[in-house]
């Protein structure tokens, strides 16, 4: 997931004028930018964030929003603060009219503005079976650990904090911060206003259909009684969470948004920052058949979004939408019909659907697995999820076919037992957002803080590509494909695994050109070879076949196109070992398939050749796909054949470090 | 009607900065890659920069580090930022446009004089 | 880099004759390779790309060839508004994009 896509509109106003004779005026060129929703019914005008550059203190925070008030009443205009942010993000919400909007952008300190917009609940017993491992029987649902060690914050409407399902399980705290209901013949009806939210609470940990039923729960309303928030009341609640994190340390923290409006850049940020505080978030991918990436906080990378499936695992139907999917969603868990407390009585129950449902199963499981391992990271968590989920059982058929490459085929489920999956070597698939169609137009794939990039591949619809490279970028490595003139666009998968006291480089060989191919290998000590990437300047590869793949003796080698530059990823790490498999078809084949077996686990997907008609090459799960042009295009022609190239790798520290434990 | 309008261009020192600047008509700009060309007094034509509109960048090797390109998309406007100037600096510098159906650059602008000289 | 010769320097000829300019990668560039005319005092304005396909507003007379390290530009009979230089450009390695130093194309 990553903050670069979506119909997001973003208008920028340069800070040119030193008007108002500023104290403190920005650098020359440097430019602060306005945002709105790109869907226009969800734009909340005349409320407005104002985002402050990183290292603004509240002192200075509070004295822009008084600098704002000061020239806008020179204006004959009225302002008003109405939060000053500090804790998740420096800022301040003021509501005011757009004529202001230049003369805000000019501040000193202002990173930039956000028109304030709307959220909504995503919602419109199969569901334990499905997350339960087969050796439980849903009527016995007994999970190892309830939770009882994690706190679940969840920002919804209010709840029934005395139903039965939940009652001493959720603590309701003071915060409220939600908009006016809409109509004016609207009627608050407590078991309507609080719907949503007790049926979530429940289903995260309720005594008889919760998932997590030893996990405390803190709710905070941020949704009003029709489901509808605003994008700086879910902030403050975010800031609120941060604080009371602050003041009150406990355990591990889960919080669940199961709500979603429109792409936002400053929500995404709220969520990134609570995010590496340690907190882990879960949000609903949204409910509009969709890209999830168009919405915010689904977008967030890191954020654990979700969608939703039913008990045929069947991506959900809601009315003529459905549950989102791309690649900003990490899994789907179940969120149809879902039985769960309801509002109406004490005892009463009642089914709803939705990715807020989904969401609210990931994170009642993500609570047991923190109680069973507290000191899991966010990163070992999501691999976690992903890896204990249930693989390609979803049907792709659903989603639209540009996206089926790009959705998770997962299903979350509960680890057969909460222990000992430490030995295992976590690596997950993260594409990036699509590069756009002109030739210099490039697409970044990034990983997570704690994981390490040990393969990096591109795949194009068109074939026309110029390969990928990993590069360094702000202390990390990231994975970078490339366009080509004539391509509709690229995309970059990095694979990005979990791999303590990792030691990793890129080496590179220029292209062989005189040669029959470049190749490169790991020649430092102790280094293994985890994936090979290709990049090429010219635009057209020519049919050049490389030679014998890799000269025995010398696995830890990459080859490729005379014309191209070759990457490998060397690693070094306890105990890490890894192989190459490779799978070649001498006939045209549309795809061509590597595994890795048992107790190994796929770090690096290559294609060879790397010539034209290869569309490229990207993991699913432990497998390695290598995409080519239909094969009526091809042709039987030698040039036709391909060889898809899979690095397995395992780790006998970590087992060794797990049979200790055990 | 296309059109793109180059600024900036003047007479500056060596070890001076300058900042050029290119704004846009009749084309949605973010749309379109866009480069700089330069061309010093009776020479040929030479590739400076180019951006993508996402803001993928790329570079000639002689101005790699000193020259920066970047775009403003919502305000149809392209920038490049030169510092650590040189006398081999000098020329008319262009901006140009290149379409995902043709290749090569399709529009050129007037282009602004560079001149580096103490 | 991909380094791009011009042959001739100069070429003179006389209105209503044929022109014939050259140009040379020093590798292939398949075909990507495109042509530009420029008048003094004026920007390059593009001519052919893809070595042989003529861009808008340019008449049947241009036309080009070639493909590999070799390619031709012809002029069938030049007009006096044809007298300008005519530069070559390669597309298929980058960056950078390289250009050819020109043919001045003046009377006879």
């Known amino acids: 997931q990553e903050d670069e896509d979506g119909d997001y509109e973003e208008l920028v106003l340069a800070l040119r004028s030193e008007e108002d004779g500023l104290a403190e005026a920005p650098e020359h060129g440097t430019t602060a930018t306005f945002h709105r929703c790109a869907k226009d019914p969800w734009r909340l005008p005349g409320t407005y964030v104002v985002v402050l550059k990183e290292e603004t203190h509240l002192s200075q925070s509070e004295r822009t929003a008084r600098r704002l008030q000061a020239q806008a009443a020179r204006r004959g205009y009225l302002t008003k603060i109405l939060h000053v942010f500090h804790g998740l993000l420096p800022g301040f919400l003021v509501k005011m009219s757009g004529d202001l909007l230049e003369l805000a952008l000019k501040l000193p300190h202002v990173d930039y503005i956000e028109e304030d917009s709307s959220v909504f609940a995503q919602s419109i017993p199969w569901n334990l079976e499905r997350i339960t491992p087969p050796r439980y029987r849903a009527d016995e649902y007994q999970p190892p650990d309830g939770g009882s060690l994690v706190e679940v914050y969840l920002l919804d409407t209010s709840i029934q904090s005395d139903h039965r399902e939940i009652e001493g399980r959720v603590m309701v705290t003071d915060f409220e911060n939600v908009p006016e209901e809409d109509g004016t013949r609207f009627h608050r009806q407590a078991s309507k206003c609080d719907s949503h939210g007790t049926h979530l609470a429940g289903v995260v940990s309720g005594r008889d259909a919760g998932v997590a039923k030893g996990a405390s729960m803190r709710s905070l309303r941020v949704l009003n009684c029709q489901g509808k928030g605003t994008v700086s009341g879910t902030l403050i609640g975010l800031e609120f969470i941060r604080k009371s994190q602050l003041v009150q340390p406990v355990g591990p923290l889960v919080v669940l948004l199961p709500l979603a409006g429109g792409y936002s850049r400053v929500l995404n940020a709220a969520c990134q920052r609570l995010a590496r505080a340690g907190v882990v978030l879960v949000t609903a991918a949204g409910n509009f058949r969709d890209d999830a990436c168009l919405y915010s906080p689904a977008s967030a990378p890191e954020v654990i979004t979700v969608g939703a499936t039913n008990a045929q695992d069947q991506p959900v139907t809601l009315g003529t939408l459905g549950t989102n999917f791309g690649r900003c969603v990490d899994l789907f868990a179940p969120g149809e019909d879902i039985i769960g407390a309801s509002s109406d009585c004490s005892t009463c129950f009642v089914s709803q659907s939705g990715t807020s449902q989904a969401a609210a199963h990931v994170a009642g499981i993500a609570a047991m697995m923190l109680s069973a391992e507290p000191e899991l990271t966010l990163a070992e968590l999501r691999q976690r999820l992903i890896h204990f989920s249930a693989k390609d059982v979803i049907n792709e058929a659903w989603f639209p076919e540009d996206q089926r490459v790009l959705t998770p085929n997962l299903v979350a489920a509960l680890p057969p037992s909460t222990h000992g999956a430490g030995w295992q070597l976590f690596c997950r698939t993260v594409w990036s957002a699509h590069s756009g169609p002109t030739r210099m137009a490039t697409a970044v794939a990034r990983c997570a803080p704690d994981e390490e990039l040990l393969s990096c591949s591109s795949f194009s619809r068109s074939g026309k590509r110029r390969g990928e490279r990993m590069e360094a970028q702000g202390g990390k490595l990231v994975c970078r494909a490339h366009n080509a003139f004539g391509g509709e666009g690229v995309y970059a998968i990095a694979r990005c695994c979990l791999l303590p006291q990792a030691n990793c480089s890129v080496h590179t060989a220029p292209p062989a050109e005189a040669s029959m191919g470049t190749r490169v290998h790991c020649h430092q000590q102790g280094h293994v070879l985890t994936g090979c990437s290709s990049h090429w300047e010219v635009e057209d590869l020519g049919t050049h076949k490389p030679p014998v793949l890799r000269p025995r003796g010398q696995p830890n080698q990459c080859v490729g196109h005379r014309e191209a530059s070759i990457h490998a990823s060397c690693c070094h790490a306890p105990g890490l070992e890894c192989k190459v498999k490779e799978h070649g078809i001498p006939a045209p084949q549309e795809q061509v398939t590597v595994a890795c077996e048992e107790g190994w686990t796929l770090t690096g997907c290559s294609a060879l050749p790397g010539t034209s008609h290869v569309l490229g090459a990207y993991a699913v799960d432990n497998t390695c796909v290598v995409r080519s042009r239909d094969v009526s295009t091809t042709g039987s022609t030698s040039e036709g054949a391909v060889t898809a190239v899979a690095i397995c790798c395992r780790s006998r520290h970590l087992a060794q470090a797990s049979q200790e434990l055990q | 009607e296309v059109q793109l309008v180059e600024s900036g261009g003047g007479l500056v020192q060596p070890g001076g900065s300058l900042r050029l600047s290119c704004v846009v008509s009749?084309?949605?700009?973010?749309?379109?890659?866009m480069h700089w060309v330069r061309q010093a007094t009776g020479r040929g034509l030479e590739w400076v920069s180019g951006?993508?509109?996402?803001?993928?960048?790329s570079y000639t090797g002689s101005v790699k580090g000193r020259f920066t390109i970047s775009r403003e998309n919502a305000k149809n406007s392209l920038h490049l930022q030169m510092n650590s100037l040189t006398t081999g600096d000098t020329a008319i510098y262009y901006c140009?446009?290149?379409?995902?159906?043709?290749?090569?650059?399709?529009?050129w602008g007037q282009g602004t004089l560079v001149t580096v000289s103490s | 880099e991909i380094v791009m010769t011009q042959s001739p320097a100069t070429l003179s000829v006389s209105p209503g004759e044929r022109g014939t300019l050259s140009c040379r990668a020093s590798?292939?560039?398949?075909?990507?390779l495109a042509w530009y005319q420029q008048k003094p005092g004026q920007a390059p304005r593009l001519l052919i790309y893809?070595?042989?396909t003529r861009a808008t507003g340019f008449p049947a007379r241009f036309s080009g060839s070639g493909s590999g390290t070799e390619f031709t530009l012809t002029i069938s009979s030049l007009q006096s508004e044809d007298f300008a230089v005519y530069y070559c450009q390669q597309y298929n390695k980058w960056p950078p994009f390289t250009f050819g130093p020109g043919t001045k194309v003046d009377f006879k």
């Open positions: 590798q292939s560039v398949s075909s990507n």
């Open positions: 009749g084309f949605t700009f973010g749309d379109y890659d």
């Open positions: 893809g070595a042989s």
């Open positions: 140009a446009r290149e379409d995902i159906a043709v290749p090569g650059f399709d529009y």
């Open positions: 951006i993508a509109p996402a803001g993928d960048t």
